[in-house]
Interface confidence: medium
Amino acid sequence: MSAQESCLSLIKYFLFVFNLFFFVLGSLIFCFGIWILIDKTSFVSFVGLAFVPLQIWSKVLAISGIFTMGIALLGCVGALKELRCLLGLYFGMLLLLFATQITLGILISTQRAQLERSLRDVVEKTIQKYGTNPEETAAEESWDYVQFQLRCCGWHYPQDWFQVLILRGNGSEAHRVPCSCYNLSATNDSTILDKVILPQLSRLGHLARSRHSADICAVPAESHIYREGCAQGLQKWLHNNLISIVGICLGVGLLELGFMTLSIFLCRNLDHVYNRLARYR
Protein backbone atom coordinates (compact mmCIF):
# COMPACT_ATOMS: atom_id res chain seq x y z
CA MET A 1 0.00 0.00 0.00
CA SER A 2 1.56 3.31 -1.13
CA ALA A 3 1.75 6.43 0.99
CA GLN A 4 -0.92 8.09 -1.12
CA GLU A 5 -3.31 5.18 -0.65
CA SER A 6 -2.80 5.03 3.09
CA CYS A 7 -3.24 8.81 3.25
CA LEU A 8 -6.52 8.55 1.31
CA SER A 9 -7.64 5.67 3.51
CA LEU A 10 -6.91 7.74 6.60
CA ILE A 11 -8.88 10.70 5.18
CA LYS A 12 -11.75 8.39 4.24
CA TYR A 13 -12.10 6.94 7.74
CA PHE A 14 -11.48 10.30 9.38
CA LEU A 15 -14.35 11.80 7.36
CA PHE A 16 -16.51 8.77 8.13
CA VAL A 17 -15.92 8.87 11.91
CA PHE A 18 -16.41 12.64 12.24
CA ASN A 19 -19.53 12.66 10.10
CA LEU A 20 -20.88 9.70 12.06
CA PHE A 21 -20.40 11.80 15.22
CA PHE A 22 -22.28 14.72 13.60
CA PHE A 23 -25.00 12.37 12.41
CA VAL A 24 -25.54 11.14 15.99
CA LEU A 25 -25.43 14.75 17.23
CA GLY A 26 -27.98 15.76 14.59
CA SER A 27 -30.31 12.94 15.49
CA LEU A 28 -30.08 13.89 19.19
CA ILE A 29 -30.92 17.52 18.34
CA PHE A 30 -33.81 16.32 16.17
CA CYS A 31 -35.10 14.06 18.98
CA PHE A 32 -34.99 16.97 21.44
CA GLY A 33 -36.97 19.09 19.00
CA ILE A 34 -39.61 16.39 18.55
CA TRP A 35 -39.76 15.79 22.31
CA ILE A 36 -40.51 19.48 22.91
CA LEU A 37 -43.14 19.49 20.15
CA ILE A 38 -44.89 16.41 21.50
CA ASP A 39 -44.56 16.88 25.26
CA LYS A 40 -43.59 20.34 26.49
CA THR A 41 -44.32 19.79 30.18
CA SER A 42 -41.99 16.83 30.69
CA PHE A 43 -39.22 18.70 28.85
CA VAL A 44 -39.64 21.81 31.05
CA SER A 45 -39.44 19.72 34.22
CA PHE A 46 -36.41 17.88 32.79
CA VAL A 47 -34.54 21.09 31.88
CA GLY A 48 -35.77 22.96 34.97
CA LEU A 49 -35.68 26.38 33.34
CA ALA A 50 -38.29 29.12 33.49
CA PHE A 51 -39.40 31.11 30.45
CA VAL A 52 -37.97 28.79 27.77
CA PRO A 53 -39.21 29.77 24.29
CA LEU A 54 -40.23 26.18 23.50
CA GLN A 55 -42.38 26.83 20.47
CA ILE A 56 -39.54 28.36 18.47
CA TRP A 57 -36.84 26.06 19.83
CA SER A 58 -38.73 22.89 19.03
CA LYS A 59 -38.88 23.85 15.35
CA VAL A 60 -35.34 25.25 15.27
CA LEU A 61 -33.95 22.08 16.87
CA ALA A 62 -35.93 19.76 14.61
CA ILE A 63 -34.88 21.58 11.41
CA SER A 64 -31.24 21.93 12.55
CA GLY A 65 -31.20 18.24 13.46
CA ILE A 66 -32.49 17.13 10.07
CA PHE A 67 -30.03 19.44 8.28
CA THR A 68 -27.06 18.20 10.34
CA MET A 69 -28.12 14.57 9.84
CA GLY A 70 -28.50 15.12 6.10
CA ILE A 71 -25.06 16.65 5.58
CA ALA A 72 -23.40 14.14 7.91
CA LEU A 73 -25.07 11.23 6.11
CA LEU A 74 -23.73 12.46 2.77
CA GLY A 75 -20.22 12.69 4.25
CA CYS A 76 -20.50 9.30 5.97
CA VAL A 77 -21.76 7.27 3.02
CA GLY A 78 -19.74 9.24 0.46
CA ALA A 79 -16.47 8.62 2.30
CA LEU A 80 -17.13 5.00 3.27
CA LYS A 81 -18.44 3.90 -0.13
CA GLU A 82 -16.08 6.24 -1.98
CA LEU A 83 -18.95 7.70 -4.02
CA ARG A 84 -17.83 10.82 -5.86
CA CYS A 85 -21.36 12.13 -6.45
CA LEU A 86 -22.16 12.05 -2.69
CA LEU A 87 -18.79 13.58 -1.77
CA GLY A 88 -19.39 16.31 -4.37
CA LEU A 89 -22.85 16.95 -2.95
CA TYR A 90 -21.38 16.99 0.59
CA PHE A 91 -18.76 19.53 -0.52
CA GLY A 92 -21.45 21.63 -2.23
CA MET A 93 -23.68 21.67 0.84
CA LEU A 94 -20.78 22.68 3.10
CA LEU A 95 -19.73 25.36 0.61
CA LEU A 96 -23.27 26.72 0.55
CA LEU A 97 -23.38 26.74 4.37
CA PHE A 98 -19.97 28.43 4.56
CA ALA A 99 -20.96 31.05 1.98
CA THR A 100 -24.19 31.74 3.89
CA GLN A 101 -22.24 32.26 7.12
CA ILE A 102 -19.76 34.60 5.42
CA THR A 103 -22.63 36.58 3.84
CA LEU A 104 -24.39 36.81 7.22
CA GLY A 105 -21.19 37.98 8.86
CA ILE A 106 -20.71 40.72 6.27
CA LEU A 107 -24.36 41.78 6.51
CA ILE A 108 -24.23 41.93 10.31
CA SER A 109 -21.09 44.07 10.31
CA THR A 110 -22.21 46.45 7.54
CA GLN A 111 -25.94 46.73 8.30
CA ARG A 112 -25.67 46.92 12.09
CA ALA A 113 -27.84 50.03 12.53
CA GLN A 114 -30.61 48.61 10.33
CA LEU A 115 -30.47 45.26 12.12
CA GLU A 116 -30.66 46.98 15.51
CA ARG A 117 -33.66 48.99 14.37
CA SER A 118 -35.38 45.93 12.88
CA LEU A 119 -34.85 44.09 16.15
CA ARG A 120 -36.25 47.04 18.09
CA ASP A 121 -39.30 47.15 15.81
CA VAL A 122 -39.93 43.42 16.32
CA VAL A 123 -39.59 43.83 20.09
CA GLU A 124 -41.89 46.88 20.06
CA LYS A 125 -44.56 44.93 18.18
CA THR A 126 -44.17 42.01 20.60
CA ILE A 127 -44.52 44.33 23.59
CA GLN A 128 -47.51 46.15 22.11
CA LYS A 129 -49.37 42.96 21.20
CA TYR A 130 -48.32 41.02 24.31
CA GLY A 131 -51.02 38.65 25.52
CA THR A 132 -53.59 39.60 22.91
CA ASN A 133 -52.96 37.08 20.16
CA PRO A 134 -52.64 33.32 20.78
CA GLU A 135 -50.67 32.99 17.52
CA GLU A 136 -47.96 35.33 18.82
CA THR A 137 -46.94 33.16 21.78
CA ALA A 138 -43.63 32.13 20.12
CA ALA A 139 -42.38 35.72 19.93
CA GLU A 140 -43.64 36.42 23.45
CA GLU A 141 -41.97 33.33 24.89
CA SER A 142 -38.71 34.30 23.18
CA TRP A 143 -38.83 37.84 24.54
CA ASP A 144 -39.69 36.57 28.02
CA TYR A 145 -36.66 34.28 27.79
CA VAL A 146 -34.41 37.20 26.77
CA GLN A 147 -35.69 39.31 29.70
CA PHE A 148 -35.29 36.43 32.13
CA GLN A 149 -31.80 35.41 30.96
CA LEU A 150 -30.33 38.90 30.46
CA ARG A 151 -31.99 40.18 33.64
CA CYS A 152 -33.58 43.11 31.85
CA CYS A 153 -37.05 44.48 31.18
CA GLY A 154 -38.47 46.19 28.12
CA TRP A 155 -36.35 47.48 25.22
CA HIS A 156 -35.14 50.88 26.43
CA TYR A 157 -36.69 50.86 29.90
CA PRO A 158 -39.08 48.69 31.94
CA GLN A 159 -41.65 51.44 31.37
CA ASP A 160 -41.91 50.35 27.74
CA TRP A 161 -44.46 47.86 29.02
CA PHE A 162 -46.62 50.65 30.44
CA GLN A 163 -47.29 51.82 26.88
CA VAL A 164 -49.32 48.70 26.32
CA LEU A 165 -52.93 49.51 27.13
CA ILE A 166 -53.70 45.89 27.98
CA LEU A 167 -50.97 45.94 30.62
CA ARG A 168 -51.79 49.42 31.96
CA GLY A 169 -53.12 49.65 35.47
CA ASN A 170 -56.69 50.90 35.72
CA GLY A 171 -57.40 53.68 38.16
CA SER A 172 -55.11 53.52 41.16
CA GLU A 173 -53.93 49.99 40.38
CA ALA A 174 -50.24 49.35 39.87
CA HIS A 175 -48.77 49.13 36.41
CA ARG A 176 -48.14 45.61 35.14
CA VAL A 177 -45.22 43.90 33.47
CA PRO A 178 -44.61 40.29 32.41
CA CYS A 179 -43.35 38.15 35.27
CA SER A 180 -40.12 37.56 33.34
CA CYS A 181 -39.21 41.15 34.34
CA TYR A 182 -39.03 40.16 38.00
CA ASN A 183 -35.72 39.87 39.76
CA LEU A 184 -36.59 36.83 41.84
CA SER A 185 -33.19 36.80 43.54
CA ALA A 186 -33.76 40.34 44.87
CA THR A 187 -36.74 39.34 46.97
CA ASN A 188 -37.82 36.45 49.12
CA ASP A 189 -41.32 37.89 49.32
CA SER A 190 -43.54 35.52 47.36
CA THR A 191 -46.49 37.91 47.53
CA ILE A 192 -44.69 40.34 45.26
CA LEU A 193 -45.25 37.92 42.42
CA ASP A 194 -48.95 38.54 42.56
CA LYS A 195 -49.82 37.14 39.17
CA VAL A 196 -52.56 39.01 37.42
CA ILE A 197 -54.42 37.80 34.39
CA LEU A 198 -56.21 40.84 33.07
CA PRO A 199 -59.89 40.66 32.08
CA GLN A 200 -58.83 41.22 28.48
CA LEU A 201 -56.67 38.12 28.69
CA SER A 202 -59.30 35.94 30.29
CA ARG A 203 -61.25 35.82 27.05
CA LEU A 204 -58.34 33.93 25.54
CA GLY A 205 -59.10 31.27 28.12
CA HIS A 206 -56.76 28.34 28.57
CA LEU A 207 -54.36 29.43 25.82
CA ALA A 208 -53.33 32.60 27.61
CA ARG A 209 -53.00 30.91 30.96
CA SER A 210 -51.36 27.67 29.96
CA ARG A 211 -47.88 29.08 29.57
CA HIS A 212 -46.44 30.74 32.64
CA SER A 213 -44.28 33.13 30.61
CA ALA A 214 -47.47 35.03 29.69
CA ASP A 215 -48.26 35.63 33.34
CA ILE A 216 -48.53 39.31 34.12
CA CYS A 217 -47.39 40.71 37.45
CA ALA A 218 -48.39 43.87 39.24
CA VAL A 219 -45.60 46.39 39.84
CA PRO A 220 -45.60 47.68 43.42
CA ALA A 221 -44.10 51.13 44.06
CA GLU A 222 -40.74 49.73 45.10
CA SER A 223 -40.84 46.60 42.97
CA HIS A 224 -38.03 44.18 42.34
CA ILE A 225 -38.15 44.36 38.58
CA TYR A 226 -35.04 44.59 36.44
CA ARG A 227 -34.20 48.27 36.07
CA GLU A 228 -32.21 47.91 32.85
CA GLY A 229 -33.66 47.82 29.37
CA CYS A 230 -32.74 44.86 27.18
CA ALA A 231 -31.09 47.06 24.54
CA GLN A 232 -28.31 47.73 27.07
CA GLY A 233 -28.50 44.15 28.32
CA LEU A 234 -27.97 42.76 24.81
CA GLN A 235 -25.10 45.18 24.19
CA LYS A 236 -23.44 44.12 27.44
CA TRP A 237 -24.01 40.44 26.65
CA LEU A 238 -22.50 40.82 23.17
CA HIS A 239 -19.57 42.79 24.55
CA ASN A 240 -18.88 40.22 27.28
CA ASN A 241 -19.26 37.24 24.96
CA LEU A 242 -17.71 38.69 21.81
CA ILE A 243 -14.53 36.59 22.03
CA SER A 244 -16.56 33.41 22.59
CA ILE A 245 -18.93 34.22 19.71
CA VAL A 246 -16.08 35.04 17.32
CA GLY A 247 -14.21 31.94 18.52
CA ILE A 248 -17.19 29.65 17.92
CA CYS A 249 -17.86 31.18 14.49
CA LEU A 250 -14.19 30.81 13.50
CA GLY A 251 -14.12 27.27 14.87
CA VAL A 252 -17.23 26.26 12.92
CA GLY A 253 -15.89 27.97 9.79
CA LEU A 254 -12.51 26.26 10.04
CA LEU A 255 -14.19 22.91 10.69
CA GLU A 256 -16.31 23.38 7.56
CA LEU A 257 -13.27 24.43 5.54
CA GLY A 258 -11.39 21.38 6.82
CA PHE A 259 -14.16 18.97 5.87
CA MET A 260 -14.58 20.70 2.49
CA THR A 261 -10.85 20.35 1.78
CA LEU A 262 -10.79 16.70 2.83
CA SER A 263 -13.90 15.81 0.83
CA ILE A 264 -12.69 17.51 -2.35
CA PHE A 265 -9.23 15.96 -1.90
CA LEU A 266 -10.76 12.51 -1.50
CA CYS A 267 -13.13 13.11 -4.39
CA ARG A 268 -10.34 14.22 -6.77
CA ASN A 269 -7.94 11.45 -5.82
CA LEU A 270 -10.32 8.49 -5.95
CA ASP A 271 -9.78 8.29 -9.74
CA HIS A 272 -5.99 8.01 -9.48
CA VAL A 273 -6.23 5.20 -6.96
CA TYR A 274 -8.75 3.29 -9.08
CA ASN A 275 -6.57 3.73 -12.19
CA ARG A 276 -3.53 2.40 -10.39
CA LEU A 277 -5.49 -0.53 -8.93
CA ALA A 278 -6.80 -1.36 -12.43
CA ARG A 279 -3.24 -1.48 -13.80
CA TYR A 280 -2.13 -3.92 -11.08
CA ARG A 281 -4.95 -6.35 -11.91
Epitope: R117, H156, Q159, D160, Q163, L165, H175, A231
Partner: antibody, heavy 119, light 107 residues
Framework: QVQLVQSGAEVVKPGASVKVSCKAS????????MYWVKQAPGQRLEWMGY????????TYNQKFKGRATLTVDTSASTAYIELSSLRSEDTAVYYC????????????WGQGTLVTVSS | DIQMTQSPSSLSASVGDRVTITCKAS??????VDWYQQKPGKSPKLLIN???TRHTGVPSRFSGSGSGTDYTLTISSLQPEDFATYYC?????????FGQGTKLEIK
Amino acid sequence: QVQLVQSGAEVVKPGASVKVSCKASGYSFTDYNMYWVKQAPGQRLEWMGYIDPYNGDTTYNQKFKGRATLTVDTSASTAYIELSSLRSEDTAVYYCARSPYGHYAMDYWGQGTLVTVSS
Amino acid sequence: DIQMTQSPSSLSASVGDRVTITCKASQDVSTAVDWYQQKPGKSPKLLINWASTRHTGVPSRFSGSGSGTDYTLTISSLQPEDFATYYCRQHYSTPFTFGQGTKLEIK
Protein backbone atom coordinates in the same frame (compact mmCIF):
# COMPACT_ATOMS: atom_id res chain seq x y z
CA GLN B 1 -22.47 58.74 28.74
CA VAL B 2 -25.44 60.24 26.88
CA GLN B 3 -24.86 63.83 25.76
CA LEU B 4 -26.85 66.26 23.64
CA VAL B 5 -24.81 69.31 22.68
CA GLN B 6 -26.63 72.21 21.04
CA SER B 7 -25.26 75.03 18.90
CA GLY B 8 -24.64 78.47 20.38
CA ALA B 9 -26.97 81.43 20.89
CA GLU B 10 -28.29 83.26 17.84
CA VAL B 11 -29.48 86.81 17.28
CA VAL B 12 -31.61 87.15 14.16
CA LYS B 13 -33.73 89.78 12.48
CA PRO B 14 -37.52 89.44 12.14
CA GLY B 15 -38.50 87.56 8.99
CA ALA B 16 -35.18 85.72 8.83
CA SER B 17 -34.51 82.02 9.45
CA VAL B 18 -32.30 80.18 11.91
CA LYS B 19 -31.07 76.60 12.12
CA VAL B 20 -30.26 75.13 15.53
CA SER B 21 -28.28 71.90 15.76
CA CYS B 22 -28.18 69.19 18.42
CA LYS B 23 -25.29 66.71 18.33
CA ALA B 24 -25.93 63.41 20.09
CA SER B 25 -23.33 61.07 21.53
CA GLY B 26 -23.13 58.13 23.93
CA TYR B 27 -26.02 56.16 22.44
CA SER B 28 -27.37 54.76 19.16
CA PHE B 29 -28.71 57.90 17.48
CA THR B 30 -31.27 56.16 15.27
CA ASP B 31 -32.75 54.26 18.21
CA TYR B 32 -34.33 57.31 19.89
CA ASN B 33 -36.69 60.04 18.74
CA MET B 34 -35.51 63.62 19.02
CA TYR B 35 -37.94 66.09 20.57
CA TRP B 36 -37.77 69.87 20.30
CA VAL B 37 -39.18 72.02 23.09
CA LYS B 38 -39.57 75.82 23.23
CA GLN B 39 -39.35 77.92 26.38
CA ALA B 40 -40.11 81.61 25.96
CA PRO B 41 -38.92 83.88 28.80
CA GLY B 42 -41.06 83.31 31.89
CA GLN B 43 -43.34 80.92 29.97
CA ARG B 44 -44.16 77.23 30.29
CA LEU B 45 -42.42 74.64 28.16
CA GLU B 46 -44.00 74.00 24.75
CA TRP B 47 -43.60 70.82 22.71
CA MET B 48 -42.83 71.66 19.08
CA GLY B 49 -42.48 68.22 17.52
CA TYR B 50 -40.25 65.20 17.21
CA ILE B 51 -38.36 63.34 14.53
CA ASP B 52 -37.46 59.66 14.22
CA PRO B 53 -33.81 59.74 13.06
CA TYR B 54 -34.08 56.23 11.66
CA ASN B 55 -36.47 57.14 8.85
CA GLY B 56 -36.88 60.91 9.15
CA ASP B 57 -40.57 60.65 10.11
CA THR B 58 -41.76 63.82 11.82
CA THR B 59 -44.67 64.70 14.10
CA TYR B 60 -45.36 68.39 14.66
CA ASN B 61 -47.39 70.47 17.05
CA GLN B 62 -49.89 72.16 14.66
CA LYS B 63 -48.96 75.50 16.22
CA PHE B 64 -45.44 75.24 14.81
CA LYS B 65 -46.16 73.35 11.59
CA GLY B 66 -45.01 75.28 8.55
CA ARG B 67 -42.56 77.48 10.44
CA ALA B 68 -40.48 74.78 12.09
CA THR B 69 -38.71 72.06 10.11
CA LEU B 70 -37.08 69.09 11.78
CA THR B 71 -34.26 67.23 10.03
CA VAL B 72 -31.44 64.86 10.94
CA ASP B 73 -28.00 63.94 9.64
CA THR B 74 -27.55 60.36 10.84
CA SER B 75 -23.93 60.18 9.70
CA ALA B 76 -23.11 63.07 12.03
CA SER B 77 -25.62 61.97 14.74
CA THR B 78 -27.07 65.46 14.62
CA ALA B 79 -30.65 66.73 14.70
CA TYR B 80 -31.67 70.16 13.42
CA ILE B 81 -34.59 72.51 13.79
CA GLU B 82 -35.01 75.30 11.26
CA LEU B 83 -37.26 78.18 12.24
CA SER B 84 -38.42 80.45 9.44
CA SER B 85 -40.24 83.81 9.18
CA LEU B 86 -39.13 84.65 12.69
CA ARG B 87 -41.11 87.05 14.85
CA SER B 88 -40.37 88.67 18.22
CA GLU B 89 -42.53 86.03 19.99
CA ASP B 90 -40.11 83.37 18.72
CA THR B 91 -37.48 84.69 21.13
CA ALA B 92 -36.95 81.71 23.39
CA VAL B 93 -34.64 78.95 24.51
CA TYR B 94 -35.00 75.91 22.25
CA TYR B 95 -34.18 72.51 23.71
CA CYS B 96 -33.59 69.20 22.03
CA ALA B 97 -34.35 66.11 24.09
CA ARG B 98 -34.28 62.42 23.29
CA SER B 99 -37.14 60.04 23.86
CA PRO B 100 -37.27 56.27 23.28
CA TYR B 101 -40.64 56.55 21.53
CA GLY B 102 -43.05 59.26 20.45
CA HIS B 103 -45.41 58.90 23.42
CA TYR B 104 -42.78 58.76 26.11
CA ALA B 105 -40.75 60.82 28.55
CA MET B 106 -37.73 62.89 27.50
CA ASP B 107 -34.91 61.32 29.46
CA TYR B 108 -31.95 63.45 28.34
CA TRP B 109 -31.94 67.12 27.30
CA GLY B 110 -29.57 69.43 25.48
CA GLN B 111 -28.31 72.55 27.25
CA GLY B 112 -30.64 74.78 25.21
CA THR B 113 -30.05 77.40 22.51
CA LEU B 114 -31.23 80.96 23.02
CA VAL B 115 -32.65 82.47 19.85
CA THR B 116 -33.24 86.22 20.07
CA VAL B 117 -35.36 87.85 17.36
CA SER B 118 -34.58 91.53 17.32
CA SER B 119 -34.35 94.27 14.74
CA ASP C 1 -55.68 69.96 23.14
CA ILE C 2 -55.36 68.53 26.64
CA GLN C 3 -54.76 71.26 29.22
CA MET C 4 -52.49 70.53 32.19
CA THR C 5 -53.17 72.75 35.20
CA GLN C 6 -50.60 72.75 37.96
CA SER C 7 -51.15 73.94 41.48
CA PRO C 8 -49.88 75.84 43.29
CA SER C 9 -48.07 78.15 40.85
CA SER C 10 -45.48 78.82 43.54
CA LEU C 11 -44.86 77.69 47.05
CA SER C 12 -42.42 78.41 49.86
CA ALA C 13 -41.12 75.62 52.02
CA SER C 14 -38.25 74.80 54.34
CA VAL C 15 -35.60 72.09 54.18
CA GLY C 16 -37.05 68.87 55.57
CA ASP C 17 -40.65 69.74 54.66
CA ARG C 18 -42.95 67.42 52.80
CA VAL C 19 -44.18 69.04 49.61
CA THR C 20 -46.97 68.00 47.23
CA ILE C 21 -47.51 69.49 43.79
CA THR C 22 -50.64 68.57 41.86
CA CYS C 23 -51.42 68.48 38.19
CA LYS C 24 -54.92 68.22 36.73
CA ALA C 25 -55.52 67.16 33.13
CA SER C 26 -58.57 68.38 31.21
CA GLN C 27 -59.30 64.74 30.29
CA ASP C 28 -58.19 61.24 31.27
CA VAL C 29 -54.53 60.79 30.31
CA SER C 30 -54.23 57.19 31.52
CA THR C 31 -51.03 57.66 33.62
CA ALA C 32 -49.11 59.06 30.61
CA VAL C 33 -47.67 61.83 32.78
CA ASP C 34 -44.05 62.90 33.40
CA TRP C 35 -42.59 65.29 35.94
CA TYR C 36 -39.55 67.47 35.24
CA GLN C 37 -37.36 69.64 37.44
CA GLN C 38 -35.78 72.80 36.06
CA LYS C 39 -33.26 74.99 37.81
CA PRO C 40 -32.63 78.59 36.64
CA GLY C 41 -30.48 78.69 33.49
CA LYS C 42 -30.47 74.91 33.20
CA SER C 43 -32.33 72.43 31.03
CA PRO C 44 -35.19 70.38 32.50
CA LYS C 45 -34.40 67.04 34.10
CA LEU C 46 -36.71 64.03 34.08
CA LEU C 47 -37.82 62.96 37.56
CA ILE C 48 -40.88 60.72 37.12
CA ASN C 49 -42.37 59.02 34.10
CA TRP C 50 -45.59 57.09 33.64
CA ALA C 51 -47.01 58.96 36.65
CA SER C 52 -45.18 56.94 39.29
CA THR C 53 -41.86 55.55 37.98
CA ARG C 54 -38.74 57.34 39.15
CA HIS C 55 -36.16 57.87 36.44
CA THR C 56 -32.69 56.33 36.88
CA GLY C 57 -30.64 58.18 39.49
CA VAL C 58 -33.54 60.20 40.91
CA PRO C 59 -33.52 60.20 44.74
CA SER C 60 -36.21 58.14 46.49
CA ARG C 61 -37.62 61.24 48.22
CA PHE C 62 -39.32 62.04 44.90
CA SER C 63 -42.47 60.06 44.23
CA GLY C 64 -45.35 60.34 41.82
CA SER C 65 -48.88 59.04 41.92
CA GLY C 66 -52.26 59.49 40.32
CA SER C 67 -54.56 58.19 37.62
CA GLY C 68 -57.25 59.45 35.31
CA THR C 69 -57.04 63.25 35.43
CA ASP C 70 -55.32 63.88 38.78
CA TYR C 71 -51.60 63.48 39.38
CA THR C 72 -49.26 64.46 42.19
CA LEU C 73 -45.55 64.85 42.72
CA THR C 74 -44.41 64.48 46.32
CA ILE C 75 -41.05 65.38 47.82
CA SER C 76 -40.97 63.63 51.18
CA SER C 77 -38.17 65.66 52.76
CA LEU C 78 -36.99 68.78 50.96
CA GLN C 79 -33.27 69.17 50.38
CA PRO C 80 -31.51 72.46 49.50
CA GLU C 81 -30.94 71.23 45.90
CA ASP C 82 -34.68 70.63 45.39
CA PHE C 83 -35.57 74.32 45.14
CA ALA C 84 -36.46 74.70 41.48
CA THR C 85 -39.43 74.84 39.10
CA TYR C 86 -41.39 71.63 38.50
CA TYR C 87 -43.40 70.85 35.39
CA CYS C 88 -45.84 68.07 34.63
CA ARG C 89 -46.46 66.94 31.06
CA GLN C 90 -48.94 64.61 29.38
CA HIS C 91 -47.81 62.38 26.53
CA TYR C 92 -51.16 60.68 26.09
CA SER C 93 -52.05 62.52 22.89
CA THR C 94 -50.49 65.11 20.62
CA PRO C 95 -49.89 67.95 21.03
CA PHE C 96 -48.09 66.97 24.21
CA THR C 97 -48.68 69.69 26.77
CA PHE C 98 -46.92 70.90 29.90
CA GLY C 99 -48.30 72.42 33.06
CA GLN C 100 -47.49 76.09 33.72
CA GLY C 101 -44.93 75.08 36.34
CA THR C 102 -44.66 75.25 40.12
CA LYS C 103 -41.86 77.37 41.51
CA LEU C 104 -40.57 75.93 44.77
CA GLU C 105 -38.81 78.58 46.88
CA ILE C 106 -37.00 78.60 50.19
CA LYS C 107 -39.11 79.96 53.03
